[in-house]
């Protein structure tokens, strides 16, 4: 704590050539009495930019009316910025002395640089799709910005992510810089409609950050769940068996019916229904002529989704005298046998 502090809230200000730079400065007290002066650089060779007390500074204007009663805002604007204006600017409070004013307190300084905006962030996801519960990496890149200070945030559906690593290159002084960030995202079954956003905030963007997006629909694979159900009989010797393929993404899916291990029919998912979460449902049915079988029949619904190894669900029909309506097979895992007797 000090009796007077000179506050320069901006560590750096970036201005395009030809624009006007605003260098902010406030004092926490007006006591002791004395003028504010602005300098570029520090030490004995510093350059006077503005003196509240006296002088003519054609390129400099004050943000506030310094004659206004009890004004404590000593911010200035410097017009028509050129690269030669780059440097660190100090707002310095002087106190009246005898005979000359004495430097009393200096602000921390504001670095003025000629500015360069970052390029639009480009977000890339993994080369291969991944399933829910898996962690995938996204990268975000942006280039060509100056100064080096930059803030990068990751969001998933508006929620800020915390598991990411960011590098700004080069480490030393440079005309411009690049940022590279890798974020880890855990997929859930509801992520088909999700977006991952990389947000880059930089002084040149005037509070309006640049965003790059990636749709998790390009990354996620939600494997289907299968349910094989025996439907009411259509005729004395026919049984209708359906295979419900639920909650899968993407749509690319091929279904094969096997009777006792032999391919009966293969079809590709076409008229699918879309769920609210973006996944799909599809149903295939098979009409089995029981009279054509002397032995028990094992029906298998085999699904190949998005080029992945096939998953299947089986249903056993026992060939007997009089078929009647059967219940549902509710087993949830990929393979398994559920007997349904036909009397």
């Amino acid at each position: 704590e000090e009796e007077l502090q000179v506050i320069q809230p901006d560590k750096s200000v970036l201005v395009a050539a030809g624009e006007t730079a605003t260098l902010r400065c406030t004092a926490t007290s007006l006591i002791p009495v004395g003028p504010i002066q602005w300098f570029r650089g520090a030490g004995p060779g510093r350059e006077l930019i503005y003196n509240q007390k006296e002088g003519h500074f054609p390129r400099v204007t004050t943000v506030s009316d310094l004659t206004k009663r009890n004004n404590m805002d000593f911010s200035i604007r410097i017009g028509n910025i050129t690269p030669a204006d780059a440097g660190t600017y100090y707002c310095v409070k002087f106190r009246k002395g005898s005979p000359d004013d004495v430097e009393f307190k200096s602000g921390a300084g504001t670095e003025l640089s000629v500015r360069a905006k970052p390029s639009a962030p480009v977000v890339s996801g993994p080369a291969a799709r991944a399933t829910p519960q898996h962690t995938v990496s996204f990268t975000c890149e942006s280039h060509g910005f100056s100064p080096r200070d930059i803030t990068l945030k990751w969001f998933k559906n508006g929620n800020e992510l915390s598991d990411f690593q960011t590098n700004v290159d080069p480490v030393g002084e440079s005309v411009s810089y690049s940022i590279h960030s890798t974020a880890k995202v855990v997929l859930t079954r509801e992520d088909v409609h999700s977006q991952v956003i990389c947000e880059v905030a930089h002084v040149t963007l005037q509070g309006d950050p640049l965003r790059g997006t990636a749709n998790l629909s390009e990354t996620i694979r939600v494997p289907p769940t299968l349910e094989v159900t025996q439907q009411p009989v259509r005729a004395e010797n026919q049984v209708n068996v359906t295979c419900q393929v639920r909650k899968f993404y993407p749509q690319r899916l091929q279904l094969t019916w096997l009777e006792n291990g032999n391919v009966s029919r293969t079809e590709t998912a076409s008229t699918v229904t879309e769920n609210k979460d973006g996944t799909y449902n599809w149903m295939s049915w098979l009409l089995v002529n029981v009279s054509a079988h002397r032995d028990d029949v094992k029906l298998t619904c085999q699904v190949e989704h998005d080029g992945q190894p096939a998953v299947s669900k089986s249903h056993d029909l026992k060939v007997s005298a009089h078929p009647k309506e059967q219940g549902s097979n509710t087993a949830a895992e990929n393979t398994g046998s559920n007997e349904r007797n036909i009397y």
């Epitope: 000090e2 009796e3 007006l30 006591i31 009495v33 003028p35 009663r69 009890n70 005898s98 009393f104």
Partner: antibody, heavy 114, light 111 residues
């Protein structure tokens, strides 16, 4: 909280040097200046001088030739020395914080008498 | 030196009434858009207590009954309404020019 406490001999002989100490707490002597002010019995206030946070000093021109204000930041103490005192220097001596004089000590009475 | 002349030297006020003290400087105490004039209250046996800084700004913890105004060379401290414990000496002080100076004081008595 902010506190200032003056101390020193209550009686000083004419022509000698008056030496007072102001011990402060609750703030840093590198961040704040400290004033010395005096008040003769039944009279008004007179500013003696100030030592700023950076150690520089400003004095009342009427007393400048006789006054020295110094400090020991590590001990949180500010010192006043007034040389060649006369009866006219009899007063209550106060120390007060900063150019704004927002906190004052209780004062210490100094009598100049033989 | 800037001489500060306070008037009146003393005044007696009834509780609930307004007390007005003026301070005239021998030269302007304004600099850089501010008036470097301050007011203090001193009760017997106590150090001065800051009331108003920079002519019109109330110090923290000081009742709003106290107010200050003025610029340049003419300044006013107003107490409205006066209360019994406002009986004290009141001083103006400038720190616009060295040496910093105080007014001669105004004694406020309560009727």
């Amino acid at each position: 909280q902010v506190q200032l406490q003056e101390s020193g001999p209550g009686l000083v002989k004419p022509s000698q040097t008056l030496s007072l100490t102001c011990t402060v707490s609750g703030f840093s002597l590198t961040g704040y200046g400290v004033n010395w002010i005096r008040q003769p019995p039944g009279k008004g206030l007179e500013w003696i001088g100030i030592i700023w946070g950076d150690g520089s000093t400003d004095y009342n021109s009427a007393l400048k030739s006789r006054v020295t204000i110094s400090k020991d930041t590590s001990k949180n103490q500010v010192f006043l020395k007034l040389s060649s005192v006369t009866a006219a220097d009899t007063a209550v001596y106060y120390c007060a914080r900063a150019g704004k004089m927002d906190y004052w000590g209780q004062g210490t009475t100094v009598t100049v008498s033989s | 030196d800037i001489v500060l002349t306070q008037s009146p030297a003393s005044l007696a006020v009834s509780p609930g009434q307004r007390a007005t003290i003026t301070c005239r400087a021998s030269e302007s105490v304004d600099s850089y858009g501010s008036s470097f004039m301050h007011w203090y209250q001193q009760k017997p046996g106590q150090p001065p207590k800051p009331l108003i800084y920079l002519a019109s700004n109330l110090e923290s913890g000081v009742p709003a009954r106290f107010s200050g105004s003025g610029s340049g060379t003419d300044f006013t401290l107003t107490i409205n309404p006066v209360e019994a414990n406002d009986a004290a000496n009141y001083y103006c002080q400038q720190n616009n020019e060295y040496p910093w100076t105080f007014g001669g004081g105004t004694k406020v008595e309560i009727k």
